[in-house]
Interface confidence: low
C-alpha cells in the first residue's frame, strides 16, 4: 500500500482514503432519492434518472459520462385491459377472480403508474383448463410428476410456487412437459419468516404480494430481436417468431391470498412428500383439477400483455487511467427497477453512487487510478440483462483485449447476517487481503475484521478457518462479461442466515413493498451494512486499478479445477459400466489439471521475483494474468447455448442463478440413463471431457514462461 | 465568477509570524484540494504546501515543515497558511492555487510577503 | 525529490515562429505532467495538463507531448501575447516540483 493519502499532489494514494471518503448518510440520501417513484425500463421516469445519474457523476468528477442507448424487445401489461386469473364454473361465469394490482403501501396511495404483477414477455392468451401443483416447477419436481406419479401435464395449467430457481427455468419445464399455462405464487412457507409480521409492520410478503419477473430462457443472448449483435440504429431484427427464449404459453404471478383460493380446492394427487408441502392451510394435492364438489369447474387465465420495442439507456461514466488507460476495470449495477426498487437494484445503485463521489473526489484532489474505470448504470436487466449485454455485444472487441475485471453492483442486501461473494478463483485472495482490511459492521464482532464476521458465520466447507465463496451463475449483469467474454468478475453483498431462513431470496422481491422504508426501518437503520458492502465493491475496485501487479492468483484456478474435475469425475463413476462399455477416460482432463497446477505455481515464484521497475515486463506479467479468465472461453460455446462460452464455469442449464461447473460435461451427464441412444449419449460425454481437458491445458500454457 | 483572493503578506522581521488568507468564491470549494505555491523575487515556482478538501489530509514541502502549517475553513471558503520562524529565504510572492486532476487550474493574484531586518 | 529540468532557459523567437520547450523529468512521471505560462506581475495559468490534454480557453496552438520523463510544448505559431516566461511541473509524486522555467522573448 502507498503512504500519501489523498490530495492533489501524488497519483500513489492508498486505498485507506478511498475508503474514508465512503459514507453511510451519503448512500441513504441517494437510496431515497432513487426509490420516491418507479424506474420502469422503457419509462420515461427511468430515462430521467438516467440523465440525473450521468450529471451528478459529472459533478463528482468522472472524466466523462455519457448515455448509451438502445431498441431491445420489452413487455408491458395493457392498461386497458388487465391480465388476471379466474375460476370458472360449468357456464364459464368466473366465481373468481385474482387482484388486479397489490394494494399499495403507506404514502404511495397517489403515486401513479406503478405498473401491475406481471410476468414479463408472457404471450398473449385465455388458456382455460384443469390445475396441476408442481411444486417448484423444477427439473425434478417433473421427474417426481411424470415418472412417479404418471401425472401427465399435457394440456393443462400448472401452478408453481416460486422459489429455488430461477423462474424462466420453471417456465421452460412447464412448456416441455405440455403445459397450455403457468401460474407462479409465493407460497409463505417460501417468503414468510417466522416471527416477523408482514409489510409494513415488518420484512415480510402481505397475501396481496406479488413478485414480478421475466419468464425468458435467452442463455446469454440479449435481446430477443438481436442476439449477439448491439440493438442500435441499423440493427437487424428477428420477427417475433424467430425471436430468442421467448415462451410460448401464458404465465401469470399472483400472491398468497389468491394461491389459497386455486390450491384448497385441488384434488387428484396427494403431494409425494411433505417437500412438496408449503405453509397455506391447503392440502396441497398435485391434481390433475379439483375435488370431487368443485371438478366441473376450472382455470381461467386472461392475459393481454404486449411485448414492444422499447428506447432503453445506459449511463458509462469514464475515470481515465494515468498509467495503463487501454486496462478497464468496471463498475456496473442496473438502475431499473419493477416498482420503487428499494432493494433491488437501488440499494445497489446508491452504493455505485458513493463510490462514484469517493473516485471523483480523489480525482479532484489529483489521483488518477493506473488504469482506467468503467462505471455503469445499466438499463433493462429486469428484462433480461439487456442494458449490459447489448453495451456488452456493442464494445465486444474493446472489451475482450482491455477487460481486467468486472465487479457488479447489483442489490447490496438481501438480507443483514453476513458477507456473501460469488467470484472467479482469481479475486479469492483478493476479497480475503481486503476484508482482513475492513471492519465487521456485525453485532458481537466490535472491533473484529470482516474477514473474521464472515468466516464465523458462513464458513467455506473445504477450508477451515476460510469463509465461503460462491460460484458465479447468472440472473445479473455480470452475465455477458463473464460468461461470454471471459473476463474475470465478482459480486459481493450483504445477505441471510440461510440455515435459519429458508426462504428464497428475501420476502419482498420485485414487489411494491421494496421501498425506502423496508431498508431504513427494517434492514439496515443505520446504514452499516450498505457502506460495508461500498467498501468490499469499492475496495476491489480500487486494487484492481490501481495495484501494480494485478491482485489475481492463479493458483486459486489450479486448486478448483481439481476439486470440479474430481466432482465431475465422481458424478460419472455413478455408471461405470457404461464408462467401461464406452471407453470413457477423464485422464486427459487429470492431466491438464495437473499441468495447469504446476504452471500456475512457476508463474506465481516468477510473479514475485520478476523486475516491477521494468514497465514491459511488468505489463508482459499483467497481461498474462488478464487473459487467463479469456482462456477458458471456447469460441464456439457450450452445445446450444452459444452465448455461454466460459468451460469452467456456466449458468445451471436447471437454474440460471446457480453456477455450475465443466456445464459441458455436467449437462451430458444429466439424466444421461434415460437417453434413448446411449452410444450418442456417451460419446457426447467423452467429446465434452476432451474440450475440457484441451481448455484447462490451453489456459495452462499461457502462464507458462513466454520464451 | 470563479476566482481566489490572497490577502495576508507584508514585511516581517526574521524569526517572526504571519498568516496568509485565500478566499475562494465561483465554485464549491470543499470539492477540491488547495496549494501554496511561491515565486522569489526574479526567481521560478516553488510548491509550499497542500491540503485534501476535506481538510483531513496535509502535505508540506522540506523547506518550511515544521514551521508553517496550512488549514482550511470550508464554512468560509476560506484557506490558510500559518507562518511562523519566518527567514529571509522566504520571501516571496505567495500564490494559492486550486488542485484538480493533478493539475493547478486556478490561481490567485498573489501577496507579497518580505522578510527583512 | 524529482528534479525538472528544462531546456532552454530563454528562447527569442518572432511573431509566427513555431516554438519548442522541452522539459525532462529524473524519473518516470507517467503523463503527469503539465505547462503554465507566466507573465510578469501575473499569476501563472495553466495550458496543459496530463502531457497533452489543452486546458479549456487556451488556444489551439499551443500543445502537449511526451510520457516518461521526457516532454515538449509547442507552440505552432508564436502570437504578441504569448512572450512569456513557460513553466513545468510535475505531480506524480511527494512534492511536485517546477522546471526552472523558459522566457520566450521578442527577438
Known amino acids: 500500500k502507498s503512504s500519501n493519502e489523498a490530495t492533489n499532489i501524488t497519483p500513489k494514494h492508498n486505498m485507506k482514503a478511498f475508503l474514508d471518503e465512503l459514507k453511510a448518510e451519503n448512500i441513504k440520501k441517494f437510496l431515497y432519492n432513487f426509490t420516491q417513484i418507479p424506474h420502469l425500463a422503457g419509462t420515461e421516469q427511468n430515462f430521467q434518472l438516467a440523465k440525473q445519474i450521468q450529471s451528478q457523476w459529472k459533478e463528482f468528477g468522472l472524466d466523462s459520462v455519457e448515455l448509451a442507448h438502445y431498441d431491445v424487445l420489452l413487455s408491458y401489461p395493457n392498461k386497458t385491459h388487465p391480465n388476471y386469473i379466474s375460476i370458472i364454473n360449468e357456464d364459464g361465469n368466473e366465481i373468481f377472480n385474482t387482484s388486479l394490482f397489490e394494494p399499495p403501501p403507506p404514502g404511495y396511495e397517489n403515486v401513479s403508474d406503478i405498473v401491475p404483477p406481471f410476468s414479463a414477455f408472457s404471450p398473449q392468451g385465455m388458456p382455460e383448463g384443469d390445475l396441476v401443483y408442481v411444486n417448484y416447477a423444477r427439473t425434478e419436481d417433473f421427474f417426481k410428476l411424470e415418472r412417479d406419479m404418471k401425472i401427465n401435464c399435457s394440456g393443462k395449467i400448472v401452478i408453481a410456487r416460486y422459489g429455488k430457481v430461477f423462474r424462466g427455468n420453471k417456465v421452460k419445464n412447464a412448456q416441455l412437459a405440455g403445459a397450455k399455462g403457468v401460474i407462479l405464487y409465493s407460497d409463505p412457507a417460501d417468503y414468510f419468516a417466522p416471527g416477523v409480521k408482514s409489510y409494513p409492520d415488518g420484512w415480510n410478503l402481505p397475501g396481496g404480494g406479488v413478485q414480478r419477473g421475466n419468464i425468458l430462457n435467452l442463455n446469454g443472448a440479449g435481446d430477443p430481436l438481436t442476439p449477439g449483435y448491439p440493438a442500435n440504429e441499423y440493427a437487424y431484427r428477428r420477427g417475433i417468431a424467430e425471436a430468442v427464449g421467448l415462451p410460448s404459453i401464458p404465465v401469470h404471478p399472483i400472491g398468497y391470498y389468491d394461491a389459497q383460493k386455486l390450491l384448497e380446492k385441488m384434488g387428484g394427487s396427494a403431494p409425494p412428500d411433505s417437500s412438496w408441502r408449503g405453509s397455506l392451510k391447503v392440502p396441497y394435492n398435485v391434481g390433475p383439477g379439483f375435488t370431487g364438489n368443485f371438478s366441473t369447474q376450472k382455470v381461467k387465465m386472461h392475459i393481454h400483455s404486449t411485448n414492444e420495442v422499447t428506447r432503453i439507456y445506459n449511463v458509462i461514466g469514464t475515470l481515465r487511467g494515468a498509467v495503463e488507460p487501454d486496462r478497464y476495470v468496471i463498475l456496473g449495477g442496473h438502475r431499473d427497477s419493477w416498482v420503487f426498487g428499494g432493494i433491488d437494484p437501488q440499494s445497489g445503485a446508491a452504493v455505485v453512487h458513493e463510490i462514484v463521489r469517493s473516485f471523483g473526489t480523489l480525482k479532484k484532489e489529483g489521483w488518477r487510478p493506473r488504469r482506467t474505470i468503467l462505471f455503469a448504470s445499466w438499463d433493462a436487466e429486469e428484462f433480461g440483462l439487456l442494458g449490459s449485454t447489448e453495451w456488452a455485444e456493442e464494445n465486444s472487441r474493446l472489451l475482450q483485449e482491455r477487460g481486467v475485471a468486472y465487479i457488479n453492483a447489483d442489490s447490496s442486501i438481501e438480507g443483514n447476517y453476513t458477507l456473501r461473494v460469488d467470484c472467479t478463483p482469481l479475486m479469492y485472495s483478493l476479497v480475503h487481503n481486503l476484508t482482513k482490511e475492513l471492519k465487521s459492521p456485525d453485532e458481537g464482532f466490535e472491533g473484529k475484521s470482516l474477514y473474521e464476521s464472515w468466516t464465523k458465520k458462513s464458513p467455506s466447507p473445504e477450508f477451515s478457518g476460510m469463509p465461503r465463496i460462491s460460484k458465479l451463475g447468472s440472473g445479473n449483469d455480470f452475465e455477458v462479461f463473464f460468461q461470454r467474454l471471459g473476463i474475470a468478475s465478482g459480486r459481493a453483498r450483504y445477505t441471510k442466515n440461510w440455515e435459519t431462513n429458508k426462504f428464497s431470496g428475501y420476502p419482498l422481491y420485485h414487489s411494491v413493498y421494496e421501498t425506502y422504508e423496508l431498508v431504513e426501518k427494517f434492514y439496515d437503520p443505520m446504514f452499516k451494512y450498505h457502506l460495508t458492502v461500498a467498501q468490499v465493491r469499492g475496495g476491489m475496485v480500487f486494487e484492481l486499478a490501481n495495484s501494480i501487479v494485478l491482485p489475481f492468483d492463479c493458483r486459486d484456478y489450479a486448486v478448483v479445477l481439481r476439486k470440479y474435475a474430481d466432482k465431475i469425475y465422481s458424478i460419472s463413476m455413478k455408471h461405470p459400466q457404461e464408462m467401461k462399455t464406452y471407453s470413457v477416460s477423464f485422464d486427459s482432463l487429470f492431466s491438464a489439471v495437473k499441468n495447469f497446477t504446476e504452471i500456475a505455481s512457476k508463474f506465481s515464484e516468477r510473479l514475485q521475483d520478476f523486475d516491477k521497475s521494468n514497465p514491459i515486463v511488468l505489463r508482459m506479467m499483467n497481461d498474462q494474468l488478464m487473459f487467463l479468465e479469456r482462456a477458458f472461453i471456447d469460441p464456439l460455446g457450450l452445445p446450444d447455448r452459444p452465448f455461454y462460452r466460459h468451460v469452467i464455469y456456466a449458468p445451471s442449464s436447471h437454474n440460471k442463478y446457480a453456477g455450475e461447473s465443466f456445464p459441458g460435461i455436467y449437462d451430458a451427464l444429466f439424466d444421461i440413463e434415460s437417453k434413448v441412444d446411449p452410444s450418442k449419449a456417451w460419446g457426447e460425454v467423452k467429446r465434452q471431457i476432451y474440450v475440457a481437458a484441451f481448455t484447462v491445458q490451453a489456459a495452462a500454457e499461457t502462464l507458462s514462461e513466454v520464451a | 465568477e470563479v476566482q481566489l483572493l490572497e490577502s495576508g503578506g507584508g514585511l516581517v522581521q526574521p524569526g517572526g509570524s504571519l498568516r496568509l488568507s485565500c478566499a475562494a468564491s465561483?465554485?464549491?470549494?470543499?470539492?477540491?484540494?488547495m496549494n501554496w505555491v511561491r515565486q522569489a523575487p526574479g526567481k521560478g515556482l516553488e510548491w509550499v504546501s497542500a491540503?485534501?478538501?476535506?481538510?483531513?489530509?496535509?502535505h508540506y514541502a522540506d523547506s518550511v515543515k515544521g514551521r508553517f502549517t496550512i488549514s482550511r475553513d470550508n464554512s468560509k471558503n476560506t484557506l490558510y497558511l500559518q507562518m511562523n520562524s519566518l527567514r529571509a529565504e522566504d520571501t516571496a510572492v505567495y500564490y494559492c492555487?486550486?488542485?484538480?486532476?493533478?493539475?493547478?487550474?486556478?490561481w490567485g493574484q498573489g501577496t507579497l510577503v518580505t522578510v527583512s531586518s | 525529490d524529482i528534479q525538472m529540468t528544462q531546456s532552454p532557459s530563454s528562447l527569442s523567437a518572432s511573431v509566427g515562429d513555431r516554438v519548442t520547450i522541452t522539459c525532462r523529468a529524473s524519473q518516470s512521471i507517467s503523463r503527469y505532467l503539465h505547462w503554465y505560462q507566466q507573465k510578469p506581475g501575473k499569476a501563472p495559468k495553466l495550458l496543459i495538463y496530463d502531457a497533452s490534454n489543452l486546458q479549456s480557453g487556451v488556444p489551439s496552438r499551443f500543445s502537449g507531448s511526451g510520457s516518461g520523463t521526457d516532454f515538449t510544448l509547442t507552440i505552432s505559431s508564436l502570437q504578441p501575447e504569448d512572450f512569456a516566461t513557460y513553466y513545468c511541473?510535475?505531480?506524480?509524486?511527494?512534492?511536485?516540483?517546477f522546471g526552472g522555467g523558459t522566457k520566450v522573448e521578442i527577438k
Open positions: 492555487a486550486r488542485g484538480v486532476a493533478a493539475t493547478l487550474n486556478l
Open positions: 491540503i485534501s478538501g476535506s481538510g483531513g489530509t496535509t
Open positions: 511541473q510535475q505531480s506524480y509524486s511527494n512534492p511536485p516540483t
Open positions: 465561483g465554485f464549491t470549494f470543499n470539492n477540491y484540494a
